[in-house]
Amino acid sequence: KEEKTTFRDCAEIFKSGLTTSGIYTLTFPNSTEEVKAYCDMDMGGGGWTVIQHREDGSVDFQRTWKEYKEGFGSPLGEYWLGNEFVSQLTSGHRYVLKIQLKDWEGSEAHSLYEHFYLSGEESNYRIHLTGLTGTAGKISSISQPGSDFSTKDSDNDKCICKCSQMLTGGWWFDACGPSNLNGQYYPQKQNTNKFNGIKWYYWKGSGYSLKATTMMIRPADF
């Protein structure tokens, strides 16, 4: 009986010779559980596993802890890959995180973190980031040191408020912090002075809600 080839991330898929961007099936480390992800095989050498994407507001990102844990949306469009998979993946290997951003004026920018991982669910999928470079700000818009993940039904932030309810979306809120890529999607000309938009402060400043965002990861030794 022929053994089925499994891939833990898009870098493995790329190295296997499959170099076309698209949806692929990934397998949880040390498990048979599978998840569908979008693999970007074109950006900066390819092999990127997309863990978040926003582009048109077609998917509601004001979701529960369970939904953010397991993932939601469509890998062909807007989606969240899932905290549990990303946590397991990044705890066993050193990964870089690239965040690609687009504004409504036609500009693009990125932030690249040379080491990224999520703690497990017992630590509320706390984010860990080091080594920031890129064009989307010299200061990290994800608060440092990393915060716990919060959702509308699981408040783990450092605010007297409930950031996820106030700003909408699940995110690594501080109190509430300089970013929220899972905020409310606002169309062009309605995207400024927003208290709950898609925010990356150290690129576009306060109240500016972005047009598109992509978070993607790849092994550091790719």
Epitope: C159, I160, C176, P178, F195, K199, S206, G207
Partner: nanobody, 129 residues
Framework: EVQLVESGGGLVQPGGSLRLSCAAS????????IGWFRQAPGKEREGVSA????????YYADSVKGRFTISSDNSKNTVYLQMNSLRPEDTAVYYC??????????????????????WGQGTLVTVSS
């Protein structure tokens, strides 16, 4: 739609006074804090004063304490900054900005700059003889 409109800027001699107004629309002051910020040419934007209308709490930067007074009129949805004993170093564009009042870190009294998500266009204050 959230809007903040500043007015009251102008040219004033050293030692003089001005009163800036910040008219808010699209939200009520009861649930928000309003901050006044200023930016001089070639310098970073800095916090000057802030007020939480609901609790009446106020904040002042050390450089303006005793000279500036912040107040609000919730019936007009407007915040004021009374500036007395003005100095040449007070010359800047003055902005007002809003933040939901509850967006506070445990144990803190005021808000970092990045929490203010709604901004006005600014009004120029020039202090010169």
């Amino acid at each position: 739609e959230v809007q903040l409109v500043e007015s009251g800027g102008g040219l004033v001699q050293p030692g003089g006074s001005l009163r800036l107004s910040c008219a808010a629309s699209g939200f009520t002051l009861d649930d928000y804090a309003i901050g006044w910020f200023r930016q001089a040419p070639g310098k970073e934007r800095e916090g000057v004063s802030a007020i939480r209308s609901s609790g009446g709490s106020t904040y002042y930067a050390d450089s303006v304490k005793g000279r500036f007074t912040i107040s609000s009129d919730n019936s007009k949805n407007t915040v004021y900054l009374q500036m007395n004993s003005l100095r040449p170093e007070d010359t800047a564009v003055y902005y007002c900005a809003a933040v939901p009042a509850g967006r506070l870190r445990f144990g803190e009294q005021w808000y970092p700059l990045y929490e203010y998500d709604a901004w006005g266009q600014g009004t120029l204050v020039t202090v010169s003889s």
